[in-house]
């Protein structure tokens, strides 16, 4: 707690002070006072620089004095032997003694009193800008006429702030212009125009004279313009150093004039006016501005239209143009919108084909679709090349945006059939020689794959089982092989309407229209062991002549076994129908005359005992396409025969092409269209 006076005595005073002592006293008097400290007695062991014993007087970080030895008063009327006067209200006194004293020293007696300080004169830094008034315990500042005391109670200034200019044109000058401006003042002027207009300031060089900068280049008095986050200045010196025309790009401008205590000049005068806020003619790539003008100002509207192949993407919606308005802040509305290259996106995948991952999916990019060759080809043409068009679609020159369709290649076996190992009535074959060959397990029979969804077979194969289980892709029909092959699941069986259904099929003598189609639930994936056979064309080129060779294949009866384990095949010639009629039926179920022969039947065989037999029914009689020797077409289907190893009868497929196409069309899925 501060006190106005006090006494400080060395330890044991007036007796001798002890050795090895360190004691300190913290003196504090009230704020606004200084301290007068005086010693009336001093008897401390003397040493050089008072190194042994001493009394130390410290003010803040400054040592005011260090005392030792004996002192006596020079004035017979005063007991004071040493005194200190500090203009601060705190003081520290520290007494130290070392480990030994050669004599007996009595120490010191000291007193302090609070004394008034003259803040106006006692300090280097003058506390008041103009008039300083001292009183006991403090001071106050005052100002000359027309000046006022700032909130800091120290600085005086002219009341030159608070003016707000809202007119679109005006003039502003420093106080007293052209007479010297007041010192130590901060003048603030505000220009506030309607939004959409920018403040433009104009000055003449000769209308500006402000105290020049110091040697470091810092303005002592300064004029500053602040427009939002932009600042112009500070400016000072004789003649305006800045641009004579300042476009602030803002409707709000603050003018700040700051002066110090010295060096007043005539000041400054300026004019201002409001310009409609200009918006820059921005370079927006890949677009056209409408209307095109040299300069755009507040409230101007332009339509920005993207060039072909470019679009404005906002959210998920793409547009080809947008409007932009010159706003009050000098910025265009919708400035974030840009004309970007149209992105056609990742191209759709296609069944049984592929598209290479494009390097770019933007306007002008090119992609190529290919089919899984050699098992599929591109049915709808167009070459498979698509480019990213301006409308955001992948477009082909022929098909437009329609995707290419990969359809199975028909009639091309991966390996040609060669009659290698001669066995009675035929040869061992590989499924790759007859990839269209379908195996039916109940009844044991065959069929021909004609596309992804359809199997062609004989009507008598499916009349008794409308849900046949079929397999493709295996040479052997051993269980272990079929388990690894592709099983086909039927969706529906379509028997030709001309096929007569009998109560007792075993006694059949009429095999006319022995043809059926099986629609599959799922499409078949083509490959080296699974691939369709072609259908005959409707032209006369596909009319068979006697002696024309065809291939048959199947797992039917052989000389040795009722059912073949591995696929067998034979090459046989077409024969006149009468050759089939002439053969005696092996196990007749009726008179020989009862058996029906029609133009819907092909007779073939008779050479070296090569023939189809029980279990081969429904398989294709494959003939080389007369117009494309690399392909085979299903000229016939194994139907019936008078006797195995002689001549066989085959359903003439050419006569049913219309029915086949119509049935497939009427029962196709959207996926297949």
């Amino acid at each position: 707690e501060p006190t106005m006076y006090g006494e400080i005595l060395s330890p044991n005073y007036p007796q001798a002070y002890p050795s090895e002592v360190e004691k300190s006293w913290d003196i504090e008097v009230p704020e606004g006072y200084g301290i007068h400290l005086y010693f009336t007695h001093l008897d401390i062991e003397l040493s050089e620089n008072c190194a042994y014993d001493s009394v130390q007087i410290i003010s803040g970080d400054t040592e005011e004095g260090r005392l030792c030895g004996q002192r006596s008063s020079n004035n017979p009327h005063s007991p004071i032997v040493e005194e200190f006067q500090v203009p601060y209200n705190k003081l520290q006194v520290i007494f130290k003694s070392d480990f030994s004293n050669e004599e007996r020293f009595t120490g010191f007696a000291a007193y302090y009193v609070a004394t008034d300080i003259n803040e106006c004169t006692d300090f280097v830094d003058v506390p008041c800008s103009h008039f300083c008034n001292n009183f006991i315990g403090g001071y106050f500042c005052s100002c000359p006429p027309e000046y006022f005391l700032h909130d800091d109670m120290k600085n005086c200034g002219v009341n030159c702030s608070g003016d707000v200019f809202t007119a679109l044109i005006g003039e502003i000058a420093s106080p007293n212009y052209p007479k010297p401006y007041p010192e130590n003042s901060r003048c603030e002027y505000q220009i506030r125009l309607e939004k959409g207009f920018q403040v433009v300031v104009t000055l003449r060089r000769e209308d500006f004279d402000v105290e020049a900068a110091d040697s470091a280049g810092n303005c002592l008095d300064s004029l500053v313009f602040v427009a939002g986050d932009r600042q112009f200045g500070p400016y000072c010196g004789h003649g305006f150093p800045g641009p004579l025309n300042i476009e602030t790009k803002s409707n709000a401008l603050d003018i700040i004039f700051q002066t110090d205590l010295t060096g007043q000049k005539k000041g400054w005068k300026l004019r201002y006016h409001g310009d409609p806020m200009p918006c820059p003619k921005e370079d927006t790539p890949n677009s056209v501005w409408e209307p095109a003008k040299a300069k755009y100002v507040f409230r101007d509207v332009v339509q920005i239209t993207c060039l072909d192949g470019f679009e404005v993407v906002e959210g998920r919606v793409g547009a080809t143009s947008f409007y932009s308005t010159c706003q009050s802040n000098g910025k265009w509305s919708n400035s974030k919108l840009k004309c970007q290259p149209v992105d056609c996106g990742i191209p759709e995948s296609i069944e049984n084909g592929k598209v290479e991952d494009p390097e770019s999916t933007l306007f002008g990019s090119v992609i190529r679709y290919t089919c899984e060759e050699p098992y599929y080809y591109m049915e709808n043409g167009g070459g498979g090349e698509y480019h990213c068009a301006g409308n955001g679609s992948w477009v082909n020159e022929v098909l437009g945006p329609e995707l290419p369709k990969c359809v199975p290649v028909c009639g091309v076996p991966r390996e040609p059939f060669e009659e290698k190992q001669r066995i009675i009535g035929g040869s061992d074959a590989d499924i790759k020689n007859f990839p269209w060959q379908v195996f039916f397990d109940n009844p044991w029979a065959g069929g021909a794959l004609i596309n992804e969804y359809w199997v062609l077979t004989a009507a008598h194969v499916v009349e008794g089982n409308r849900e046949p289980t079929m397999y493709v892709g295996s040479t052997s029909v051993q269980t272990s092989r079929l388990a690894k092959s592709k099983m086909l699941t039927p969706e529906h069986v379509f028997i030709h309407p001309g096929w007569k259904l009998l109560e007792v099929p075993e006694g059949r003598t009429n095999f006319d229209n022995d043809i059926a189609l099986v629609r599959l639930k799922d499409p078949v994936k083509m490959g080296p062991t699974v691939s369709p056979i072609c259908l005959p064309g409707t032209s006369s080129d596909y009319n068979l002549m006697d002696g024309d060779l065809g291939l048959i294949s199947g797992w039917g009866r052989t000389e040795k076994r009722d059912r073949a384990v591995r696929l067998k095949a034979a090459r046989l010639p077409v024969a006149p129908l009468r050759k089939c009629k002439e053969v005696k039926v092996e196990k007749p179920t009726a008179d020989a005359e009862a058996y029906v022969f029609t133009p819907n039947m092909i007779c073939a065989g008779g050479e070296k005992g090569m023939d189809s037999c029980k279990g081969d029914s429904g398989g294709a009689f494959a003939v080389q396409d007369p117009n494309d020797k690399t392909k085979f077409y299903a000229a016939g289907l194994v139907s019936w025969g008078p006797q195995c190893g002689t001549y066989g009868l085959y359903t003439r497929v050419k006569n049913y092409v219309d029915w086949i196409m119509k049935t497939m069309q009427e029962n196709s899925t959207p996926r297949e269209d």
Partner: antibody
Framework: EVQLVQSGAEVKKPGASVKVSCKVS????????MHWVRQAPGKGLEWMGT????????IYAQKFQGRVTMTEDTSTDTAYMELSSLRSEDTAVYYC????????????WGQGTLVTVSS | DIQMTQSPSTLSASVGDRVTITCRAS??????LAWYQQKPGKAPKLLIY???SLESGVPSRFSGSGSGTEFTLTISSLQPDDFATYYC?????????FGQGTKVEIK
């Protein structure tokens, strides 16, 4: 009619080998796939392996790998199964069986050969 | 390898009873499953192939069902000749594994 005739019963000491034969009649071995199955007294059936003519390789059950060898002599239409490093638990009836078609697992079974392993 | 688990191991039943034997595969085998009947000292006899197809000559009281991993053999009305051991076998892929067998005995 296809028939499979197996060699007669054998008694072997532990560590020895046994070779069982299976002669095909009424068909050729090349047209068939021969499998071998065994059954220990009072125990279940165990598939041992087969020759896969499509792949041209012999496939052995994991359990017998390294101890069994199946061979075929097409000139005599005879199949062989040799089991080495015999132990008492190999005592069983060994069957040769032809693979069936179109889902039938086995078609024709041999009469079985009893192999007894005893010290 | 595909493991085949048959249950129960033993089944006691009377003539005329409806009997069901279950076979579970450790992974899907589609319908590639067969059921056999075996009598002491005899080779196994095929009853059912492809999970549900009845071998010719087998009485119609035997039926099979299931696909994937769960299969059953049902004898609709047990006859004296049916007391035997029954095995399931998968033929989907090698190894062609058998179940451990179910013995059907007289109650």
């Amino acid at each position: 009619e296809v028939q499979l005739v197996q060699s007669g019963a054998e008694v072997k000491k532990p560590g020895a080998s046994v070779k069982v034969s299976c002669k095909v009649s009424g068909d050729t071995l090349t047209e068939l796939s021969m499998h071998w199955v065994r059954q220990a007294p009072g125990k279940g059936l165990e598939w041992m392996g087969t020759f896969d003519p499509e792949e041209g390789e012999t496939i052995y059950a994991q359990k017998f790998q390294g101890r069994v060898t199946m061979t075929e002599d097409t000139s005599t239409d005879t199949a062989y199964m040799e089991l080495s490093s015999l132990r008492s638990e190999d005592t069983a009836v060994y069957y040769c069986v032809t693979e069936g078609l179109a889902g039938f697992p086995f078609d024709i079974w041999g009469q079985g050969t009893l192999v007894t392993v005893s010290s | 390898d595909i493991q085949m688990t048959q249950s129960p191991s033993t089944l006691s039943a009377s003539v005329g009873d409806r009997v069901t034997i279950t076979c579970r595969a450790s992974q899907s085998i589609s319908s590639w499953l067969a059921w056999y009947q075996q009598k002491p000292g005899k080779a196994p006899k095929l009853l059912i192939y492809k999970a549900s197809s009845l071998e010719s000559g087998v009485p119609s009281r035997f039926s099979g069902s299931g696909s994937g991993t769960e299969f059953t053999l049902t004898i609709s009305s047990l006859q004296p000749d049916d007391f035997a051991t029954y095995y399931c076998q998968q033929v989907n892929s090698y190894d062609w594994t058998f179940g451990q067998g179910t013995k059907v005995e007289i109650k």
